[in-house]
């Protein structure tokens, strides 16, 4: 005859304060004759949690009817869980005896612990923007979870990152724990539309991790490239000069034209377009009057991007004799 086995399937049971905990225990044999009792802890000081035959256990109910003849399920429910209920619970088979029933076999035990879900991860980026090819740090924090075991991963656009450091505090026993992780991310020029994700997995989340995100658009500054060109065609006695400011982020941009070192106050036409990668292009047109007296015109397009030092591009206007003739012909 096969020897009785006491089956307690869960090694760990996470419960929430105020809720009901179910502790499972089944036996594989009806023999030997005798009761199954529940204890918390081991050793001489173990605490009796449930005894069907005697005692008053107002918070404990059985899952099955223990009076049924062939019952092999000795699972119990404990209601209104408090922090004082944590510990390891054992279902123990006793052999009928006199003057006392004799302990025959114990289950492996189920550890009841207070489970608390981690808070939604909060991801914070750097205080100031940084240009591509540089490294920025992101921090992720989540609090209030228990037990201590937790897994944190970082992703950039779905690709897992490896350069990060994580700490869980406190190191000793506690009612609840916090996690803080710092990831180092190298910025790419196309990262305006990129995201970093901090993913936290915990036993209380039942396989559905929590995520916190940060947009790299908050952390990146893509400096513009400038190009100043003279349009081949002229309109009357005016030449059209274009300043193209390409691939910059964020949008914050100040553009000024100078003619021979003098800042021009007059209105200029301009357009702003957004690129697929989230950067911007800005095109500004400047009309220059051409006359016989204007031999050497140097135009400067100066751009101040996102509070950084101004960058500029110069263009020496090429006014051909033919153009001058045309312009004088056009003069009334």
């Amino acid at each position: 005859e096969e020897e009785l086995q006491m089956i307690q399937p869960e090694k760990l049971l996470l419960v929430t304060v105020g809720k009901t905990a179910t502790l499972h225990c089944t036996v594989t044999s009806l023999l030997p004759v005798g009761p199954v009792l529940w204890f918390r802890g081991v050793g001489p000081g173990r605490e009796l949690i449930y005894n069907q035959k005697e005692g008053h256990f107002p918070r404990v109910t059985t899952v099955s009817d223990l009076t049924k003849r062939n019952n092999m399920d000795f699972s119990i429910r404990i209601s209104s869980i408090t922090p004082a209920d944590v510990g390891t619970y054992y279902c123990v088979k006793f052999r009928k005896g006199s003057p006392e029933n004799v302990e025959f076999k114990s289950g492996p035990g189920t550890e009841m612990a207070l489970g608390a879900k981690p808070s939604a991860p909060v991801v914070l980026g750097p205080a100031a923007r940084t240009t591509p090819e540089h490294t920025v740090s992101f921090t992720c924090e989540s609090h209030g979870f228990s037990p201590r075991d937790i897994t944190l991963k970082w992703f950039k656009n779905g690709n897992e990152l490896s350069d990060f450091q994580t700490n869980v505090d406190p190191t000793g026993q506690s009612v609840a724990y916090s996690i803080r992780s710092t990831a180092r991310v190298v910025l790419d020029p196309w990262d305006v539309r990129s995201q970093v994700i901090c993913e936290v997995a915990h036993v209380t989340l039942q396989g559905d991790p929590l995520r916190g995100t940060a947009n790299l658009s908050e952390a990146i500054r893509v400096p513009p490239t400038l190009e100043v060109t003279q349009q081949p065609m002229r309109v009357g006695n005016q030449v059209n000069v274009t300043c193209q400011v390409r691939k910059f982020y964020p949008q914050s941009l100040q553009l000024t034209w100078s003619e021979n070192g003098n800042v021009c106050q007059r209105e200029t036409a301009s357009t702003l377009t957004e690129n697929k990668d989230g950067t911007y292009n800005w095109t500004s047109w400047f009309l220059v009057n051409i006359s016989d007296q204007r031999d050497d015109v140097v135009l400067t397009c100066q751009v101040k991007h996102d509070g950084q030092l101004a960058v500029s591009k110069r263009l020496a206007l090429e006014v051909t004799v033919h153009q001058k003739d045309q312009s004088s012909d056009a003069t009334p």
Epitope: F39, V42, G43, P44, R46, K96, G97, S98, P99, E100, V102, E103, F104, K105, S106
Partner: antibody
């Protein structure tokens, strides 16, 4: 085969303590309660108490409460019985005995060889 | 505590004799009674448990009966190795108690 091997004879002065060991072998130590029974010279058998080797829980005869301490060491499959405040009437052979597996009535199917404790000034 | 008495306290018998030892409890102990045999300088040996069940390895000439307060150990045909002291023990309640013993010697 099941064996209970006890420590050797002891001579103690009144007021002292004695600790008798009982090493079990040949079975799963934690599965059977171990009882202690003593027998004064030329007298009958007297039950002192028992220990559950699995939990360490004990049950002691009222006569010996406060004087008897029963402990176990599962790593060495050994139970111990310590009797304190010894007096001359504690002179006896002390037996450890294994609680049987089959009977409903608490009965002892294997016994140690006995340890003679002599209390004399 | 439950008191156990045995009678006779001693008896002399010959090999082949049928020997009967009685044990009485001071209150009902159902069938929670065991019998032991002890030889000088040796530990007791379990013969009968639960009043009438023969312990494994014990010769069938030993038998037990009774319930409640009155119990009997019978040796159907006494053998030379049976000369010893016999104790009854109750297991109805704590503390476990033994009878004073019955010494069986050679006539």
């Amino acid at each position: 085969q099941v064996q209970l091997v006890q420590s050797g004879a002891e001579v103690k002065k009144p007021g002292a303590s004695v600790k008798v060991s009982c090493k079990a072998s040949g079975y799963t130590f934690t599965r059977n309660y171990v009882h202690w029974v003593r027998q004064a010279p030329g007298q009958g058998l007297e039950w002192m108490g028992r220990i559950n080797p699995n939990s360490g829980g004990t049950n002691t005869a009222q006569k010996f409460q406060g004087r008897v301490t029963m402990t176990r060491d599962t790593s060495t499959s050994t139970v111990y019985m310590e009797l304190s405040s010894l007096r001359s009437e504690d002179t006896a052979v002390y037996y450890c005995a294994r609680l049987g597996d089959v009977a409903v009535a608490a009965s002892f199917d294997y016994w140690g060889q006995g340890t003679l404790v002599t209390v004399s000034s | 505590d439950i008191q156990m008495t045995q009678s006779p306290s001693s008896l002399s018998a010959s090999v082949g004799d049928r020997v009967t030892i009685t044990c009485r409890a001071s209150q009902s102990i159902s069938s929670y009674l065991n019998w032991y045999q002890q030889k000088p300088g040796k530990a007791p040996k379990l013969l009968i448990y639960d009043a009438s069940s023969l312990e494994s390895g014990v010769p069938s000439r030993f038998s037990g009966s009774g319930s409640g307060t009155d119990f009997t150990l019978t040796i159907s045909s006494l053998q030379p190795e049976d000369f010893a002291t016999y104790y009854c023990q109750q297991a109805n309640s704590f503390p476990l108690t033994f009878g004073p013993g019955t010494k069986v010697d050679i006539k």
